[in-house]
């Protein structure tokens, strides 16, 4: 079952970040707020504390349209902001186990 | 050249402590994930703890809270305070460079592996 | 946690011959395996990252394959230097674990 003490690290949480992205690809950290000058990224929201699918579909690349809103445009990111590519040795049956626990 | 040295092996006696070190040169240190590795006499590798770049820290529990890893950025070093020291303790004890802090190479592909090691320090724990 | 299973834990060749290391997770690791080398005395070396990805410097004799639960390390053509024990490990969560290790010898 899962415990609010587990967390995803190392390929279980690029695998997991993988699916929930899909080809929209994602980011390990965010830019940094005005309010905070040091950005955090997603290995240390979820690789040291719990984290649930709502926090990593924060690090997805470009926000998935809604039914509602099909016409809004695809959030603009900065040119240097670090896009990385979907590993090729993702597989679906590994990400469920994973996305089980962060779903209970 | 890439290279780590531990030092700070030794003989100690049960209950006892010690504090390892492993000098780092040759790379940007404060962008890596640092590991110790120990591997008892005649036995495998058993995986001890790693930190972040930034002082993050994974622990295997057999060594929770009797060990400490840490790292001086500035120093280019990283640490292991041993407490209460058991006999099954006795290994050598390996550093070894891991990842980049997220994972990702320079070429934006996941790399989690240990590519760089120290040579190693004996730690002995007997009465 | 994750259990690797190496097997064979010891196996004799002779320089030339095909020789084929298995490592066995306890549950899917999607491709999230590592393969090193350690000969007496030393430090390991690590040979094979990500399942497949030969690290620098390296000889291509020397391959990586499998995803899920089921690895192998496979050396096409057995050279002296390769007499050596070797492990497997898992990247995909912690407690990061190895193999038990195979020992390979001289027949």
């Known amino acids: 079952a899962y415990r609010p003490s587990e967390t995803l690290c190392g390929g279980e949480l690029v695998d997991t970040l993988q699916f929930v992205c899909g080809d929209r690809g994602f980011y390990f950290s965010r830019p940094a707020s005005r309010v905070s000058r040091r950005s955090r990224g997603i290995v240390e929201e979820c690789c040291f504390r719990s984290c649930d699918l709502a926090l990593l579909e924060t690090y997805c690349a470009t926000p998935a349209k809604s039914e509602r809103d099909v016409s809004t445009p695809p959030t603009v990111l900065p040119d240097n902001f670090p896009r990385y590519p979907v590993g090729k040795f993702f597989q679906y049956d590994t990400w469920k186990q994973s996305t089980q626990r962060l779903r209970r | 050249e890439v290279q780590l040295l531990e030092s700070g092996g030794g003989l100690v006696q049960p209950g006892g402590s010690l504090r390892l070190s492993c000098a780092a040169s040759g790379f940007t240190f404060s962008r890596y994930w640092m590991i110790w590795v120990r591997q008892a006499p005649g036995k495998g590798l058993e995986w001890v703890s790693s930190?972040?770049?930034?002082?993050?820290?994974k622990y295997a529990d057999s060594v929770k809270g009797r060990f400490t890893i840490s790292r001086d950025n500035s120093k280019n070093t990283l640490y292991l305070q041993m407490n209460s020291l058991r006999a099954e303790d006795t290994a050598v004890y390996y550093c070894?460079?891991?990842?980049?802090?997220?994972?990702?190479?320079?070429?934006?592909?996941?790399?989690?592996?240990?590519?760089?090691w120290g040579q190693g320090t004996m730690v002995t724990v007997s009465s | 946690d994750i259990q690797m299973t190496q097997s064979p834990s010891s196996l004799s060749a002779s320089a030339g011959d095909r020789v084929t290391i298995t490592c066995r997770a306890s549950q899917s690791i999607s491709s999230y395996l590592n393969w090193y080398q350690q000969k007496p005395g030393k430090a390991p070396n690590l040979l094979i990252y990500t399942t497949s990805n030969l690290q620098g410097g390296v000889p291509s004799r020397f391959s990586g394959s499998g995803s899920g639960t089921d690895f192998t390390l496979t050396i096409s053509s057995l050279q002296p230097e390769d007499f050596a024990t070797y492990y497997c490990?898992?990247?995909?969560?912690?407690?990061?674990?190895f193999g038990g290790g195979t020992k390979v010898e001289i027949k």
């Open positions: 930190i972040r770049s930034s002082g993050e820290t």
């Open positions: 490990q898992q990247g995909y969560s912690f407690p990061l674990t």
């Open positions: 070894a460079r891991g990842p980049l802090s997220d994972y990702y190479d320079s070429s934006g592909y996941y790399f989690d592996a240990f590519d760089i």
